[in-house]
Structures are given as C-alpha cells and as structure tokens.
Interface confidence: medium
C-alpha cells in the first residue's frame, strides 16, 4: 500500500502500527519524542522500501538499531527536505547503530547524523555509493570511532565477508552493523542497481530488483512508476504525482491537498499533477484543474474585518504577505524597529491595490515609503474626514516617498494631505500631486510648505564623478569638488556602495531611520588643496561583482524658506575585474573500465568571473597496501570504550596537541593557534548547529490538538 | 477512455454459487479499490464490499460477509465477486464502481460505474 | 449501520422548476479529520447511476451548476435550479464515512 501523505509518529511507540501495510511511504516519515524505553523487537516492517521525501528520527528512547524496523528500506526519494536533508538522526540516545542495510540510494538531498551518543559504524558506510555528493553530508557529535571499535562481519576470523572502498584515502570494509554488509553491484552494472545475486537490474531500477533487467521488477522506480512498470517518463495522458509515479486526470482531480480540505484539490500543470499551481501561475477559474499565467504578479485579495489595518509592527505587516489587493484601508504607524524597511518590503511589497485610504502618521521609523514597491492604486471608496485618501502626518525621518521615475500610482478618489514631515521635500510631494491625478484636489492648507522639508536639503545641485579605476577588489573613484555659496558651509562628502547584480536600486532602498541601511556608508573628508578633487579607494570588495555608489555633500548652507541647499550625485554602477575562481566542487571519480576514469564535479562557489574552461590534471599513485590500526586479538590495543556524552568531540576535528608538528620542529609541542579562518568557519559552524537545531524543534514541535 | 466492463446476465439455481467479473480499461488499475454495489429490482442501492488490488485487502458490510467474496486479477486488470449459497433474496443487479485509493486526501467518491450484471436465481 | 432517509420519496415537478431532496443520516457522518463524505447520484432508468456532488456541496467535473448540495452534520439537502429533461431519474444520496456505507432510499424526480 501507498501510505501518505507524511507519516508523523510520536509519542507512543504503538502508533507505528501504522506502517503495517506500507510498500511506500508517499511523503516524510518522522518517527520522534519516544521517551519511554520500549522493547522494539516486536515491531518489523518488511514491506517499506521507499520513502519519497525524507526519515527523521528525532529522540527515540530505547531504539539501538533501524535494520529490524525497516529491512527492505531501500531508497529515500528526498523529493521534499528537511533543512536540505534526506536522513535526519538526531539525538537518538540509544542508537547504536543505523542498520539500514539494504539502503542504496538517496536519490536527492544529504544526511544529517548529529549528537548520537552511543551511535557506531558510521565510519564503515560508504555513503558515496548512496548519494550522490557527500560533501554536504553533516555527521558529528556521535560517539568517536576510536571508541567504537567497529569491526564488520568475518574481520575477527580474518574470512572479512565485506567488500572494500576508499573514504578519506582509507581502504576498508564496508558494512552496516557487525553482522550486515554494505551491498555494492559489479562494476559492471555501472550505474544501475543489482539483484541479491549481483545480476545487474533493468537502467530503469533503482536500489535494487528481484529479477535482472526487468523493468517490472524493480524495488523502486530510477524515474517514475506507471501501472507496475519503470519508465523515463510519464506516459500520454498521465502526470508526474510526488516525484515518482504518474497518475492519470482522474486520481489528480480526486486528491485533496494535504493542508486545507478546501474544493479546489489538485492542479495539472507542465505535465504534473501539484497541489498548487507554480509561483507565476493561477488557476484558470475556481474549479479548475488548470493554470494559466498571471499577468504581473499573481492576485490575492486580502481584507480587513474591521476595515482599516493598522501595521504598528513587521508581525501586523506579516498578515500581508502576498497580498495584491487589500480591500480596506491601511494605517501605518511604524514609530521603531529593526531592519524595517525590507521588512516591510518583504511583507508588503507585492501590495497593488488598496480600496479605502492609506494613512501614514508618528512612523519615525521610516525614511521612505518604497517599501509598498508595487502599489498603483488607491481608490479612496472610503476616506478620512475631509475627504482624504492619502494623508501624511509627522513622520519626522520621512525623505521619499517613491521614485517617481519608476513609479505609476493613481489616486482615483479623494485629496493628498501632508504636514509635520521635517525632512520631506514639498517638491517631492508636487511630484507626487502630478503623478498621481491629484494635482487640484487639495486646497491650500493640506500641503504645508513651512513644516514639511524644514530640516532637508531640498534644493540638491548635482555632483558629478570624474573617475573611476578598478581592480579584482578594489574601486577607487573621484568627484568634481563641490562649491556651495560659501565654501566654508561644505563639510565633508559621504559616499554610499554596496553590491546591485541589477541596475535598479535607488537611494532609499532598504534604508530606514533605526540604522539599517543596505548602504555602506563612508566619510570623506575635504582634500586640504583647494584644487585637489575629493575622492575614494573602496577595498576589501568582491571580484567581478557589480556596485553601486553614489556621493553626498554634507553643507550647512541655508537658501530661501530656511530649506538646507546640498548636493548629490547620480547612481554610477561599476563592476570589480574578475580574479581566480574559488576551488571547483564535490569532485567525485569513480571508474567505469580498466583503462577509464569518469570525473565529476560542481561548478565553483566563487566563479569571480565567467568560466571559460577548467583544467583537470592527474597522475598515478603507488597501490596503497592497508594495514590494521588495531589487532583486535591483542588485549591491550583494544580502544577503551566510553560512552559519549552526544556533544561535539573535539577529538573528531583536531589530533592531540602535544604530537602536532609546529613552525618545521618534530617533537612535542603545543598546539598551533588557530588562523582567524579556522576560528571564522568554527563560529560559522557553530551558528549553523544552533539554526539546524531551532529549525527543528520548530518544526516538530506542535501545538496539542484541541 | 475508462471503462468498467462488467459480465453479461447469470441465471442460477437457489444454493449455487456465481463468479461475476469487472475489467478495468484505461486506467491504473492499481491506484483504485474496486467496489460492488448491490440494487434489487425497484428497489435503492446496497454497498456490498471493496478491494484493494494491490495486495487484495477487502472490507466487507457485514451483511454480505458471508454472501460476498472479492478477489482481482492484476495481469488482466479485472476484479471478480463471487456469491455463494443463492436465494431469491440475492436476485439483483450487480455493479462495480472504482473509488481512489489514497489514504488520508482523497475527495472518495464513486467516480466511474461498471455496466451492471444481472444474477437471477431461479429454479 | 448509519442509516439514510431520503424524502420526499417521489418529486414531481414541471420543467424550469426548482426542485429540493432531503437527505438525513441517523448520525453524525462528520469524519475525525472534519471531512463529510456525502455525496449525491443520479441514476437515470436502464443506466449506471452517474456521481452529482461529493463532499456535501462540490459539484463534479461535467455536472450543470443548476446542482448544489449543502447542509452539515446530519441534515443535507440537494437543490435543482431549473429542472431539465435530462435531470429526470432516481437520486440518492450516500454516505462513505462510516463502514459499511449506505445509500438513501432514493427520490425519484419524474414530470408532474
């Protein structure tokens, strides 16, 4: 049986009953929170070969070993990840093992082996012959193989059952659990699966069969499943379903999504039977199985019970999220935060249209409103008394409120109102009274020329650079000097930059009045020669990575109306020059003949440039002759076993101190002090632990049903 | 197309048993349990059992348990019902009607019926 | 057994008018997971009978939007907004949350 669509076991050992029946579990299986000690000997569950999304185990007391629960699981799908992995084993106090011994293939995704006291034979499983990449494969804080001692099946009587692989330039046997194997196919069968007698299955297998070259008799299926047969691809008139089978118009239109129990169900689109349709698309009518395209971004109408939505917070604004028409009116009081603004994008950035009014007062926070970066359309069906639809009161860091260059917004109905915006050009705001339609509308007291744009420099003259040089990390610009009236009233220059891959950003761009800024900002001083031009060095930059800088003239000169005079340039984009790449990725050779080498790898993460080519270089080795770390007949080389504690052991990353080989000397010596590196990708790794870890205990942990 | 194709008329004499058959055209027939349906002349409509064709799991009302007996054939796509221990009371039509097999998001309904077969018991 | 009583037992009606059928269940069809599997067939003389509505009030793919169901709990009701020709025949309604599952008596819908 097909068992889905996600099996979560918790709690009571008993409900793994549930897996009784199951040949696939279509979906994730969690089995977790078991903190009674139970006797699992009496719980098997041959018939489960495949899992399509991932296994999580996550404190299981009393479970030492997943080779009698799960015999025949033979593929994970990872169709869907947990944190990016496929296998999750997470403080499972009593493992002792992982068992799965007729695991083959994870077809998508890596694992994650972490803080597993007791847990060995880690060491002894070729994960590469499972995955696909191992470098992203994350098992620490087990028990430290030294304490294990793993021995696989017939080493003790010197008859070694397993066969060997390389790991870690380390030639050794491959097995499971002392008495498990790991299965590996003849070379060969290639890529393809084989049988228990090692007969090479069908290319269409995946994992393993029980008849060779029989695309029927497959354990899993290497693409989709159709009526009991393997195949490349779906067949006509049937669809893709959870990455692994096909299904026809029918079973689509028959499931429902896992989340709602609404009418809508399951769409086709791209030849796959989903639950939604793709970002991008919509259904084309209610009812319909179908999507077409959206035109811009897709429609979703949001409304307020109570009419006017008050977004004092980024958790107010969160009720926003990917809505495009807000059937309401809309408040915004944003007096603190932090990284507000792109907050706001974030959540209300997607925003089109809104039906009432939109009021901005007391928002100190914001500098401008670029965050509403898609509204065209206010209708002021409802408005403020006085008829205003858009009113704009005491927003003391206020300075944008669009760009209207790139911005078309309409105010079908009712006036403007601003006043007490300190730092707010009326300019802007005529710009905005000709842009909008609403030029007329307002009478004269609804747009205060003296306490709007008292504290800005709203008359700016323009600066222009005059320079500009580059190398892979560095830019290094200049700027015609600016004079103001009096030159004693130029202070100083500050010139912002930061990385823009697209020729789009503006001023404001994620900038709001509680210090976040996605500028940098540095300060420049006046050239002590009058006739010397300002200028910059920008280091410590990217290779071959676009930015964008522009330049301010910081001046105290005041002009008519009191209103600051001050300077500015326009947005220059330049780009780094490109430098070496960083190290290519997941390198992988496997051989394929006796006189052939099939290499593997990804591109770099840091191409700093465009790849032209790579170049692979090889040369051959001496055959490496391995020999036994231990002799296990040997009483006193036995390791000494200890349980570990489940923490991260230091032992696992760094060899003891005291035979380190430091500045060239051999001998005893102290440890070599970590590099700034080595301490940067500690901290890195660190931090990585800690979301994983709340990710996880996000995840798992619900709330009881009512 | 899908199609449910049942068998044509059986008449029968009172104790005998009956194998009626449904084969199934145009689509997995995996993915579906396969129903029967009872309905007597003039009269509603009964839910008899059903059965899952991959591993042939049934589940019976217990008013049939002892009348009814599900089987399928995968290799021809083809579910069977036989009844057993005839009398008159079991004089009717016989339908089959897919249902999809999915556990926990499926909308479950009766979505293609087969032509029905009509048992007659007579001596 | 939950057991479907369907009324009126016979409807008759003129073409274009609207037409009602009651359906109640002796107990709560509401599965644990809140799904009702209730749906509503049609079966016209010397034919298979054809699904209407699934899930109390979901019209299936092909069927006229002159056919609604509604209701909750055990109480359902299915309305037919202008009758037509086709739309004479037996109509039941059934339950498929409960083991065994159970069809109504039927009401048959013919021209006064």
């Known amino acids: 049986e097909i068992c889905g669509p996600g099996i979560d076991i918790r709690n009571d050992y008993q409900q793994l009953k549930r897996l009784e029946n199951c040949t696939v579990i279509e979906g994730y299986l969690h089995i977790l929170l078991i903190s009674k000690a139970e006797d699992y000997r009496s719980y098997r569950f041959p018939k489960l070969t495949v899992i399509t999304e991932y296994l999580l185990l996550f404190r299981v007391a009393g479970l030492e070993s997943l080779g009698d629960l799960f015999p025949n699981l033979t593929v994970i799908r990872g169709w869907k990840l947990f944190y990016n992995y496929a296998l999750v084993i997470f403080e499972m106090t009593n493992l002792k093992d992982i068992g799965l011994y007729n695991l083959r293939n994870i077809t998508r995704g890596a694992i994650r082996i972490e803080k597993n006291a007791d847990l060995c034979y880690l060491s002894t499983v070729d994960w590469s012959l499972i995955l696909d990449a191992v470098s992203n494969n994350y098992i620490v804080g087990n028990k430290p193989p030294k304490e294990c001692g793993d021995l696989c099946p017939g080493t003790m009587e010197e008859k070694p059952m397993c066969e060997k692989t390389t790991i870690n330039n380390e030639y050794n046997y491959r097995c499971w659990t002392t008495n498990r194997c790991q299965k590996m196919c003849p070379s060969t069968c290639g890529k393809r699966a084989c049988t228990e007698n090692n007969e090479c299955c069908h290319p269409e297998c995946l994992g393993s069969c029980s008849a060779p070259d029989n695309d029927t008799a497959c354990v899993a299926c290497r693409h989709y499943y159709y009526a009991g047969v393997c195949v490349p691809a779906c067949p006509p008139n049937t669809y893709r379903f959870e990455g692994w089978r096909c299904v026809d118009r029918d079973f689509c239109a028959n499931i429902l999504s896992a989340e709602s129990s609404d009418s809508e169900g399951f769409v086709i689109h791209d030849g796959e039977c989903m639950q939604e349709c793709p970002s991008g698309f919509i259904r084309n009518g209610s009812q319909s199985m179908y999507c077409i395209p959206c035109e811009g971004p897709c429609p979703k109408v949001c409304e307020e019970e109570k009419k006017t939505k008050t977004i004092d917070s980024v958790t107010s604004a969160q009720m926003l999220q990917g809505c495009t028409i807000f059937k309401g009116n809309l408040l915004i009081n944003i007096r603190r935060g932090n990284n507000i603004a792109s907050e706001l994008e974030n959540f209300m950035g997607l925003i089109e249209v809104v039906t009432g009014y939109v009021k901005i007062r007391h928002s100190h926070a914001l500098v401008s409103l670029s965050f509403l970066k898609n509204l065209r359309l206010i209708l002021g069906e409802e408005q403020l008394e006085g008829n205003y639809s858009f009113y704009v009161l005491d927003n003391q860091n206020l300075q944008q409120l669009w760009d209207w260059d790139h911005r078309n917004l309409t105010i079908k109905a009712g006036k403007m109102y601003f006043a007490f915006n300190p730092k707010l050009c009326v300019s802007e705001i005529y710009r905005m009274e000709e842009v909008t339609g609403t030029k007329g509308r307002q009478s004269k007291g609804d747009i205060n020329t003296r306490n709007n744009g008292e504290r800005a420099s709203c008359e700016s003259d323009v600066l222009h650079f005059t320079s500009t040089t580059t190398s892979k990390n560095r830019i290094i610009i200049t700027w015609h000097r600016y004079r103001p009236p009096d030159y004693r009233d130029l202070i100083s220059f500050t010139v912002y930059y930061k990385e823009a891959p697209f020729k789009n950003v503006t001023e404001y761009d994620g900038q709001d009045a509680c210090g976040s800024n996605s500028w940098n900002m540095v300060d420049v001083d006046l050239p002590p020669n009058k006739d010397v031009e300002p200028g910059i060095l920008l280091h410590g930059l990217k290779p071959w990575t676009q930015y964008a800088v522009y330049v301010k003239a910081v001046t105290l000169t005041m002009v008519e109306n009191d209103h600051i005079r001050g300077a500015k340039s326009e947005i220059l984009y330049i780009r780094t020059n490109a430098s070496v790449p960083s190290i290519p990725l997941d390198v992988l050779s496997a051989s394929n003949s006796s006189s052939q080498l099939i290499v593997k790898w990804n591109p770099p993460s840091l191409p700093n440039g465009n790849l032209s080519y790579y170049i692979v270089r090889w040369q051959r080795q001496p055959q490496d002759g391995y020999l036994y770390r231990h002799n296990y007949c040997s009483k006193d080389k036995i390791p000494i076993r200890k349980y570990a504690d489940g923490t991260i052991d230091i032992e696992e990353v760094t060899e003891n101190p005291k035979t380190e080989v430091c500045g060239g000397e051999k001998g005893p010596c102290c440890a070599c002090p970590k590099t700034e590196a080595e301490k940067q990708a500690e901290k890195e790794e660190a931090e990585y632990r800690k979301v994983f870890e709340n990710f996880l205990h996000n995840s798992i942990f619900v709330p009881r049903p009512e | 197309e899908v199609q449910l194709q049942q068998s044509g008329p059986e008449l029968v004499k009172p104790g005998a048993s009956v194998r009626i058959s449904c084969k199934a055209s145009?689509?997995?027939?995996?993915?579906?349990?396969m129903n029967w349906v009872k309905q007597s002349h003039g009269k509603s409509l009964e839910w008899v059992a059903n059965i899952n064709p991959n591993n042939g799991g049934t589940n019976y009302n217990q008013k049939f348990k002892d009348k009814a007996t599900l089987t399928v054939d995968k290799s021809s796509n083809t579910a069977y019902m036989e009844l057993r221990s005839l009398t008159s009371e079991d004089t009717a039509v016989y339908y089959c009607?897919?249902?999809?097999?999915?556990?926990?998001?499926?909308?479950?309904?009766?979505?293609?019926w087969g032509t029905g077969t009509l048992v007659t018991v007579s001596s | 057994d939950v057991l479907m009583t369907q009324t009126p037992l016979s409807l008759p009606v003129s073409l274009g008018d609207h037409a009602s059928i009651s359906c109640r269940s002796s107990q709560s069809i509401v599965q644990s997971n809140g799904d009702t599997y209730l749906e509503w067939y049609l079966q016209k003389p010397g034919q298979s009978p054809k699904l209407l509505i699934y899930r109390i009030s979901n019209r299936f793919s092909g069927v006229p939007d002159r056919f609604s169901g509604s209701g909750s709990g055990t109480d359902f009701t299915l309305k037919i907004s202008r009758v037509e020709a086709e739309d004479l025949g037996v109509y039941y309604c059934f339950q498929g949350s409960h083991v065994p599952y159970t069809f109504g008596g039927g009401t048959k819908l013919e021209i006064k």
């Open positions: 145009g689509y997995a027939f995996t993915d579906y349990y």
């Open positions: 009607a897919r249902w999809i097999l999915y556990y926990g998001r499926s909308k479950w309904y009766f979505d293609v």
